[in-house]
Amino acid sequence: FERTRSLQDPCSNCPAGTFCDNNRNQICSPCPPNSFSSAGGQRTCDICRQCKGVFRTRKECSSTSNAECDCTPGFHCLGAGCSMCEQDCKQGQELTKKGCKDCCFGTFNDQKRGICRPWTNCSLDGKSVLVNGTKERDVVCGPSPADLSPGASSVTPPAPAREPGHSPQ
């Protein structure tokens, strides 16, 4: 037991926010400014992320956690950890190589990001269109014509919209 303990890495005692300083006999030194270590036992501290240009700081860097960025107004994050910002469009539009363009007839986008998606085809589920679609909203499907006899059940709500995918552009 004693032998095992003496072989233990002295750096394992260094907590988050410090690093094991080889230049100072492996003592635990605080991370320098603008750097952090999020776990114990680190031999170096990582440089903090800096949010510049289209990025703005959402969370400041601390000695134990990295900074987090988001995007300036009019843009939204893409990529892991917001490594890229993409221009917002209005609802009813999608971002193309030439900028924001209105959704074509028969498609909609209810968000400021993502692509225009086709209206739901109610007839595929044997239902009828209760509310017409627009550039900003999907159609609302109602009961099938056969269900519209007296005493039929009430209108089914539309399925929740899926988060649109993003093409790498």
């Epitope: 990582d46 440089i47 800096q50 510049k52 289209v54 890229m84 910002c85």
Partner: antibody, heavy 118, light 107 residues
Framework: QVQLKQSGPGLVQPSQSLSITCTVS????????VHWVRQPPGKGLEWLGV???????DYNDAFISRLSITKDNSTSQVFFKMNGLQADDTAIYYC????????????WGQGTTLTVSS | DIVMTQSQKFMSTSVGDRVSVTCKAS??????VAWYQQRPGQSPKALIC???YRYSGVPDRFTGSGSGTDFTLTISNVQSEDLAEYFC?????????FGSGTKLEIK
């Protein structure tokens, strides 16, 4: 069409300064930042600094004491000045537009070839 | 400073082949990585940002991948015009730093 055109001297004597003008067209300096990057002969790329759309600057610490980047939005010009040149500052110097989506360079100038020699 | 290491200085490939250029960061940079192509005698050209997002107009033969410390630029169906040097760049923190470059030679 987005363009960055550079003008500046090809030969500078040691201890003198380098001034390069980057004239941009097809975009506004009030919207985009402009970076400066250099490439010594046969070597890789080295970032020197940037002037952002709001006029703020960030410099590589290795050059901060002898580098100045300014701009004139009305003439669409960015001005690069580096003092105290030595032989190892011989390089191609590029201005480059900052991408609107990240901190990377989506359009580059043609480069200014600088030789520092007496 | 964050060091970006491109260990392969030269790579040789043939037209129609698939080739992967690698880049390693000295610390975790998430996906804050861009790739550039520099043809002989020309200025660099942006290919990829955010590790995997192609710039507008870049052929879809070019794909970027990776996160953390290991990044790859893959060129499928290599063309003769791909003869160039390829650089990675991190924008996690200042100073912005580049890899030393990988020269692609076409056999």
């Amino acid at each position: 069409q987005v363009q960055l055109k550079q003008s500046g001297p090809g030969l500078v004597q040691p201890s003198q300064s380098l001034s390069i003008t980057c004239t941009v067209s097809g975009f506004s300096l009030t919207t985009y930042g402009v970076h400066w990057v250099r490439q010594p002969p046969g070597k890789g790329l080295e970032w020197l600094g940037v002037i952002w759309s709001d006029g703020n600057t960030d410099y590589n610490d290795a050059f901060i004491s002898r580098l100045s980047i300014t701009k004139d939005n009305s003439t669409s010009q960015v001005f690069f000045k580096m003092n105290g040149l030595q032989a190892d500052d011989t390089a191609i110097y590029y201005c480059a537009r900052n991408s609107i989506t990240s901190v990377s360079f989506d359009c580059w100038g043609q480069g200014t070839t600088l030789t520092v020699s007496s | 400073d964050i060091v970006m290491t491109q260990s392969q200085k030269f790579m040789s490939t043939s037209v129609g082949d698939r080739v992967s250029v690698t880049c390693k960061a000295s610390q975790n940079v998430g996906t804050t990585v861009a790739w550039y192509q520099q043809r002989p005698g020309q200025s660099p050209k942006a290919l990829i940002c955010s590790a995997s997002y192609r710039y507008s107009g870049v052929p879809d033969r070019f794909t970027g991948s990776g996160s953390g410390t290991d990044f790859t630029l893959t060129i499928s169906n290599v063309q003769s015009e791909d003869l160039a040097e390829y650089f990675c760049q991190q924008y996690n923190s200042y100073p912005l730093t580049f890899g030393s470059g990988t020269k692609l030679e076409i056999k």
